[in-house]
């Protein structure tokens, strides 16, 4: 189970993980105390044939070709959390692990 | 964490789980002894706005809008295994639990 890594200048057409730094301040998300920025990454690219298909199911659906199925797409297949310090809705400061904030691997599903 | 369920004739435009029966015999996959058919389901539909987004990361990437990011797509967010009896590459009969063969829920990621 592997995935491609690319940089922002890559001409790779296939499904790949690209670097992306999310800047909460730039978004105006002022309820986030820390981090102000973090490396989130994202997935982009084509999912042709059986390249990087995470599940056998993806291949089976492609074979069956039901109505309206648009084929597999490039999406996170492994993600990890980050620790964050933030205000909740009651203005309390919370320190917690927020799941699925970083893309570790991309694939076709 | 929920997902929409649709039938195969539905005109629902949003990301939805549709029924799909996979027939291994019809595919010519004769190395599979049992089951010959199973209910696999599949995901189809549009992922607009923040509808059914599984991860906060999906929304963040949409906000950041990096080059080449195609927006979230409708993909399995919960899958389950099935038990299968099949021939392996050495012509041995194997009974095992094959992961991620059934789509239980669809979402946008």
């Amino acid at each position: 189970d592997f995935g491609l890594d690319c940089d922002e200048h890559s001409t790779e057409s296939r499904c790949c993980r690209y670097p992306l730094t999310v800047d909460f301040e730039a978004f105006g998300w002022d309820w986030i105390i820390a981090p102000k920025r973090y490396k989130a990454n994202y997935c982009s690219g084509e999912c042709e044939f059986v390249f990087l298909q995470k599940y056998p199911h993806t291949h089976l659906v492609h074979q069956a070709n039901p109505r309206g199925s648009a084929g597999p797409c490039c999406t996170p297949t492994k993600m990890s959390p980050i620790n964050m310090l933030y205000f909740n809705g009651k203005e309390q400061i919370i320190y917690g692990k927020i799941p699925a904030m970083v893309v570790d691997r991309c694939g076709c599903s | 964490d929920f997902g929409l369920d649709c039938d195969e004739h539905s005109t629902e435009s949003r990301c939805c789980r549709y029924p799909l029966t996979v027939d291994f015999e019809a595919f010519g996959w004769d190395w599979i002894i049992a089951p010959k058919r199973y209910k696999a389901n599949y995901c189809s539909g549009e992922c607009e706005f923040v509808f059914l987004q599984k991860y906060p990361h999906t929304h963040l990437v949409h906000q950041a809008n990096p080059r080449g990011s195609a927006g979230p797509c409708c993909t399995p967010t919960k899958m389950s295994p099935i038990n299968m009896l099949y021939f392996n590459g050495k012509e041995q009969i194997i009974y095992g639990k094959i992961p991620a063969m059934v789509v239980d829920r669809c979402g946008c990621s």
């Epitope: 109505r67 309206g68 648009a70 | 004739h9 539905s10 005109t11 629902e12 435009s13 539909g45 549009e46």
Partner: antibody, heavy 122, light 107 residues
Framework: EVQLLESGGGLIQPGGSLRLSCAAS????????MSWVRQAPGKGLEWVST????????FYADSVKGRFTISRDNSKNTLYLQMNSLRAEDTAVYYC???????????????WGQGTMVTVSS | EIVMTQSPATLSVSPGERATLSCRAS??????LAWYQQKPGQAPRLLIY???TRATGFPARFSGSGSGTEFTLTISSLQSEDFAIYYC?????????FGGGTKVEIK
């Protein structure tokens, strides 16, 4: 003003091909599903095909499946219908129609073009 | 496919009178039903969507009702510009299907 303008109709022999175009203006084209609906002379309305806003999903009536292909170019605000293996029964006025997006279902058409006539005859 | 049946095929009404048009679906379409008005030589115009919501540009004398399989379009007091063909259409299931139309003509 929201407008749809079809073109590409004409007289064609059975078995021939034709491509219809529909130029859209006055709305964010890529945000709306688009459809083709036809009307044979003196008859009622018949849905032909629908394509989602992104172009990722397409749907066809059984009567045209495998012969007609719907597509769109969102950069040009244009909808297309490629019609192959044309038959006499395909003779009709072809309307391009915009989805109203009144709920989450495809298929209620709030804006229609003026139509383009396709005649299949030898 | 869902078959949409409209009745009557032709309705002869005097100006100022009430017109009631019926549309029946062969199976439930929930409230995913539209009505269109078509005049000779023109494209159809969306009149009602969601079974009962009037589209922009049509006056309050037009009203739609029903859900499931039985639907009605009512024109409370017919004006000269209302004489046309009216089609119902379901958009609950593929394929999308239209009724055969009701022609509202001057009596």
């Amino acid at each position: 003003e929201v407008q749809l303008l079809e073109s590409g109709g004409g007289l064609i022999q059975p078995g021939g091909s034709l491509r219809l175009s529909c130029a859209a203006s006055g709305f964010t084209f890529s945000s709306f599903a688009m459809s083709w609906v036809r009307q044979a002379p003196g008859k009622g309305l018949e849905w032909v095909s629908t394509i989602s806003g992104s172009g990722g999903y397409t749907f066809y009536a059984d009567s045209v499946k495998g012969r007609f292909t719907i597509s769109r170019d969102n950069s040009k605000n244009t909808l297309y219908l490629q019609m192959n293996s044309l038959r006499a029964e395909d003779t009709a006025v072809y309307y391009c129609a915009k989805d109203g997006r009144y709920n989450w279902n495809y298929g209620a058409f709030d804006i229609w073009g003026q139509g383009t006539m396709v005649t299949v005859s030898s | 496919e869902i078959v949409m049946t409209q009745s009557p095929a032709t309705l002869s009404v005097s100006p100022g009178e009430r017109a009631t048009l019926s549309c029946r679906a062969s199976q439930s379409v929930s409230s995913n039903l539209a009505w269109y008005q078509q005049k000779p030589g023109q494209a159809p115009r969306l009149l009602i969507y969601g079974a009962s919501t009037r589209a922009t540009g049509f006056p309050a004398r037009f009203s739609g009702s029903g859900s499931g399989t039985e639907f009605t379009l009512t024109i409370s007091s017919l004006q000269s510009e209302d004489f046309a063909i009216y089609y119902c259409q379901q958009y609950n299931n593929w394929p999308l299907t239209f009724g055969g139309g009701t022609k509202v003509e001057i009596k």
